[in-house]
């Protein structure tokens, strides 16, 4: 025998106590599969969250951050507060990167700086805190001769013309 | 920690009307189906009704004597019963659940119920 609520199309649920028949999910509740024997209660997305999808008879809300905010955990679960490039957040609130890290996100936490003698490079361009160093080649490659990299032209002085 | 607490319970006449309440401290209904349960003694709990945005399921055993409402100023849900029967004389619990209705339903939080006794 079929299951009279395997007919109860999403959007409505399979009301027991009335002989098995299909009800409508009540306004901000929502059933996203057929057969169902209850309704979810919809997501309501306040305070720092915000309504990016509302929710519908078959589908829940959707939420995001208000601006300064992101979303973190699964579906948006919450809201962390935004720092600038170059912080970090803590209970603190944000604070910056301690010399030798750098974040360059507004979120997340500052990172050590690479460190360019581990894979046998020079530092090419120092580390701020936020952006990280870079690795330029290893001191062997700017022995003379064997230079891939084009040495900067000497500064002319100024009011002389080239010789 | 989410608390529920009903009230409003006693001792009546066949007949006679009592207005349940059940107040959440904690958190607010605002995002929770509020449900009604009862339990008579050395009897299975028995589902009453649930609330929802404006919509009030009921269970099969009783149509019209029951009536569930909100005040939302008040954080506070409300079981109206009229036209007691001895049969209704059972603990009234107030439960809280993300789904609606909560006839099949574990409920995400309950109270410590109210006693009701109809007895002439």
């Known amino acids: 025998l079929q299951d009279p609520c395997s007919n109860c199309p999403a959007g409505t649920f399979c009301d027991n106590n009335r002989n098995q028949i299909c009800s409508p999910c009540p306004p901000n509740s929502f059933s996203s599969a057929g057969g169902q024997r209850t309704c979810d209660i919809c997501r309501q997305c306040k305070g720092v969250f915000r309504t990016r999808k509302e929710c519908s008879s078959t589908s829940n809300a959707e939420c995001d951050c208000t601006p300064g905010f992101h979303c973190l955990g699964a579906g948006c679960s919450m809201c962390e507060q935004d720092c600038k490039q170059g912080q970090e957040l803590t209970k603190k609130g944000c604070k910056d990167c301690c010399f030798g890290t750098f974040n360059d996100q507004k979120r997340g936490i500052c990172r050590p700086w690479t460190n360019c003698s581990l894979d046998g490079k020079s530092v090419l361009v120092n580390g701020t805190k936020e952006r990280d160093v870079v690795c330029g080649p290893s001191p062997a490659d700017l022995s003379p001769g064997a230079s891939s990299v084009t040495p900067p032209a000497p500064a002319r002085e100024p009011g002389h013309s080239p010789q | 920690e989410v608390q529920l607490v009903e009230s409003g319970g006693g001792t009546v006449q066949p007949g006679d009307s009592l207005r349940l309440s059940c107040a959440a401290s904690g958190r607010t209904f605002d995002n929770y189906a509020v449900g009604w349960f009862r339990q008579a003694p050395g009897k299975e709990r028995q589902y009453v009704g649930t609330?929802?945005?404006?919509?009030?399921h009921y269970g099969d055993f009783e149509n019209n004597r029951f009536t569930i409402s909100r005040d939302n100023a008040k954080n506070t849900v409300y079981l109206q019963m009229d036209n007691l029967k001895p049969e209704d004389t059972a603990v009234y619990y107030c439960?809280?659940?993300?789904?609606?209705?909560?006839?099949?339903?574990?409920?995400?939080?309950q109270g410590q119920g109210t006693q009701v006794t109809v007895s002439s």
């Open positions: 439960a809280i659940s993300l789904k609606y209705p909560m006839a099949t339903v574990t409920p995400d939080y």
């Open positions: 609330y929802w945005s404006g919509y009030a």
